[in-house]
C-alpha cells in the first residue's frame, strides 16, 4: 500500500494510473466504500462523501490514463485509505494528514516559551524535528517546547515530520518581540546633549502598548520615573515627563529620547519597559549614562566620571602629545600643580578611548579655559 503524507490546509494529489493511455471509467472510494468521485464519459461525477466540495480530478490527464484524486484544504480527518478502481484493478493509497501549530501566538516576547503541537491521525506514530533560524535542532513527539526564546529565534522554523519513512515539511514564522539591544551605554562629557535610542528588533503592522523609563541615578538613593508614554499604531504620545531633566521624546518609532545636557546628577542606569497590547510580560532595555568632567581648582587638575563604569576601565590625565601623567582604574584622577598646556582626560577600555575631555591649563597667573 502506497503511503502519502499531507499537510493540514494544503492540497494533495493522489495518483491512479491505468495501463491503457486513454480515458476509461474510474472511481475513487474511501475505506468505507463510499464513492468520492469518478467519471461518466468525459464528465466528472461526485459521490456522497464528506469530501464532496473539496475533491476534484485533473480531466486533462484522463486521456493519458491518469485519474488523480485531488483533495483541497486538507483536514486531519481526511486521513484514510483511498481506493482507486480502474480496469478491474484496485489501487490503494494511504493518506496521512498532519498539522503543526504554535500553541500560542507566533509573536512571543523574548524569554517566553514556544510550544509547537503536532496534530496527527489516530494510529500514526510520527517523529518531529525542528530547526530554528539560528540552526538549533529540537526533537520530539506530539509536542515540542523551546523555553527562553532569544532574539535569534525570530524567523522561519523548519519542522520535518517523519512517518513510514516518508516526510513532510512545515514552516512556521516566529516573531520574537524584543529590543535590538538588551543593554546600551552612552558616554558623554558634562554639558553635552544625550540621545537614547531604543530600536525594536521586529516590525508589525500595528503596534500598540505603553512604556516607561525608570532612572536610577548613581547619586540618588532611589529610582525615579523619567517618562511614561503610549504607543498606538506606531505613534508615540508622551503621557507624563519629569521636569528635571527636561526630556524630549520623538513621536515616531524607533523610540528616541533626548536629554538637553549630560550632568553628573543624571549619570546612572535606566530601564525602559514596553508593555504591548494583548501580550503578557514586558520588553526591557537597559540604558546607561556615563558622564565625564574635567576641572581645575587652584593647583589641582581633576578628572572625574560618574555612572556605571566597569572596573577594567582606565581613567587617565595626560598633557597633549605626552605620556599619561596619571592612569588609574578609578572614577577620579588628579594632578597637582599641572604644567601649562592642553590636558586630556581619557576614559579607555583596553586602549580604546570611550570618552575624552580637554582642559586648557594656563600659566599659574591665569585661570583655566575649557574649550
Amino acid at each position: 500500500k502506497k503511503v502519502v503524507l499531507g499537510k493540514k490546509g494544503d492540497t494533495v494529489e493522489l495518483t491512479c494510473t491505468a495501463s491503457q493511455k486513454k480515458s476509461i471509467q474510474f472511481h475513487w472510494k474511501n475505506s468505507n466504500q463510499i464513492k468520492i468521485l469518478g467519471n461518466q464519459g468525459s464528465f466528472l461525477t461526485k459521490g456522497p462523501s464528506k469530501l464532496n466540495d473539496r475533491a476534484d480530478s485533473r480531466r486533462s490527464l484522463w486521456d493519458q490514463g491518469n485519474f488523480p484524486l485531488i483533495i483541497k484544504n486538507l483536514k486531519i480527518e481526511d486521513s484514510d485509505t483511498y481506493i482507486c478502481e480502474v480496469e478491474d484493478q484496485k489501487e490503494e493509497v494511504q493518506l496521512l494528514v498532519f498539522g503543526l501549530t504554535a500553541n500560542s501566538d507566533t509573536h512571543l516576547l523574548q524569554g517566553q516559551s514556544l510550544t509547537l503541537t503536532l496534530e496527527s491521525p489516530p494510529g500514526s506514530s510520527p517523529s518531529v524535528q525542528c530547526r530554528s533560524p539560528r540552526g538549533k535542532n529540537i526533537q520530539g513527539g506530539k509536542t515540542l517546547s523551546v523555553s527562553q526564546l532569544e532574539l535569534q529565534d525570530s524567523g522561519t522554523w523548519t519542522c520535518t515530520v517523519l512517518q513510514n519513512q516518508k516526510k513532510v515539511e512545515f514552516k512556521i514564522d516566529i516573531v520574537v518581540l524584543a529590543f535590538q539591544k538588551a543593554s546600551s551605554i552612552v558616554y558623554k562629557k558634562e554639558g553635552e546633549q544625550v540621545e537614547f535610542s531604543f530600536p525594536l528588533a521586529f516590525t508589525v503592522e500595528k503596534l500598540t502598548g505603553s512604556g516607561e523609563l525608570w532612572w536610577q541615578a548613581e547619586r540618588a538613593s532611589s529610582s525615579k520615573s523619567w517618562i511614561t508614554f503610549d504607543l498606538k499604531n506606531k505613534e508615540v504620545s508622551v503621557k507624563r515627563v519629569t521636569q528635571d531633566p527636561k526630556l524630549q521624546m520623538g513621536k515616531k518609532l524607533p523610540l528616541h529620547l533626548t536629554l538637553p545636557q549630560a550632568l553628573p546628577q543624571y549619570a546612572g542606569s535606566g530601564n525602559l519597559t514596553l508593555a504591548l497590547e494583548a501580550k503578557t510580560g514586558k520588553l526591557h532595555q537597559e540604558v546607561n549614562l556615563v558622564v565625564m568632567r574635567a576641572t581645575q581648582l587652584q593647583k589641582n587638575l581633576t578628572c572625574e566620571v560618574w555612572g556605571p563604569t566597569s572596573p577594567k576601565l582606565m581613567l587617565s590625565l595626560k598633557l597633549e602629545n605626552k605620556e599619561a601623567k596619571v592612569s588609574k582604574r578609578e572614577k577620579a584622577v588628579w594632578v597637582l600643580n599641572p604644567e601649562a598646556g592642553m590636558w586630556q582626560c581619557l576614559l579607555s577600555d583596553s586602549g580604546q578611548v570611550l570618552l575624552e575631555s580637554n582642559i586648557k591649563v594656563l600659566p599659574t597667573w591665569s585661570t583655566p579655559v575649557q574649550p
Epitope: 546633549q193 540621545e195 505613534e235 524630549q248 520623538g250 513621536k251 538637553p260
Partner: antibody, heavy 117, light 107 residues
C-alpha cells in the same frame, strides 16, 4: 485630485470667535492626522494644532491652548478650528494641512483671519 | 520645547549657483525634519521629508542631508523658479516647530 479647501476666515473684533472649516477630498480623510498652520502677514510659518485620525489626541501650540479647539468630522471629511478669545496676534492666514506622519504634505490655499477693532 | 534656528535669514544668488541653507535643532531630532518652499501668496510646498528623502514630483536639484541637530537643504543649480522663501520643520515631537525662514533672492 487630493485637495484641501479652507473657509470661515474674516474680520473679527478682539475677544470675538470664529470657526474655520476645511473640506478634504481625493484621499481617505479618516486615515490621516490633520493640522492647522498659520502665517502672520510678512512673518514665518507657525504650527497651531494637530488632531489624530479618530480625534482621540489633540496637540496645540502654547499660545492658543485654552482658546482654540481643533476637531474633525470624518463622515463629512471635514476639519475645524474653533477660535475663541481672539487677539490681534492671531491675525494670520490659516492653512489646513494633511499630516502624513513623516511630513506635512498637502496644504490648502489658506483662509485669512483678521482680528481688529 | 526644541528650538529650530535657520540660517541665513536671506540670501542673494544667481541662476546656476549652488545654494545651501542650514537648520539647527536645540536638541537631537534624529532625521525628523522637512523642508518647504513658499512663494508669495501661495501655500508652502513640501520638498524634502525625513531630512533627505525627495518628495515625489520635486526636481532632483533639491537635496537634504543631516541628522541629529544639524541639517542642510542644497539646491545644486539654481533655476529662476527657485527664488522663494524656504522653511525647515521639526516634526520630531509636539509642538512642531518651523525655522524662521530663508528668503532666497536674485542677485
Amino acid at each position: 485630485e487630493v485637495q484641501l479647501v479652507e473657509s470661515g476666515g474674516g474680520l473679527v473684533q478682539p475677544g470675538g470667535s470664529l470657526r474655520l472649516s476645511c473640506a478634504a477630498s481625493g484621499f481617505t480623510f479618516s486615515s490621516y492626522w490633520m493640522t492647522w498652520v498659520r502665517q502672520a502677514p510678512g512673518k514665518g510659518l507657525e504650527w497651531v494644532a494637530n488632531i489624530k485620525q479618530d480625534g482621540s489626541e489633540k496637540y496645540y501650540v502654547d499660545s492658543v491652548k485654552g482658546r482654540f479647539t481643533i476637531s474633525r468630522d470624518n463622515a463629512k471629511n471635514s476639519l475645524y478650528l474653533q477660535m475663541n478669545s481672539l487677539r490681534a496676534e492671531d491675525t494670520a492666514v490659516y492653512y489646513c494641512v494633511r499630516d502624513r506622519y513623516d511630513a506635512l504634505d498637502i496644504w490648502g490655499q489658506g483662509t485669512m483671519v483678521t482680528v481688529s477693532s | 520645547a526644541i528650538q529650530m534656528t535657520q540660517s541665513p535669514s536671506s540670501l542673494s544668488a544667481s541662476v546656476g549657483d549652488r545654494v545651501t541653507i542650514t537648520c539647527r535643532a536645540s536638541q537631537g531630532i534624529r532625521n525628523d525634519l522637512n523642508w518647504y518652499q513658499q512663494k508669495p501668496g501661495k501655500a508652502p510646498k513640501l520638498l524634502i521629508y525625513a531630512a533627505s528623502s525627495l518628495q515625489s514630483g520635486v526636481p532632483s536639484r533639491f537635496s537634504g542631508s543631516g541628522s541629529g541637530t544639524d541639517f542642510t537643504l542644497t539646491i545644486s543649480s539654481l533655476q529662476a523658479e527657485d527664488f522663494a522663501t524656504y522653511y525647515c520643520l521639526k516634526d520630531y515631537n509636539y509642538p512642531y516647530t518651523f525655522g524662521q525662514g530663508t528668503k532666497l533672492e536674485i542677485k
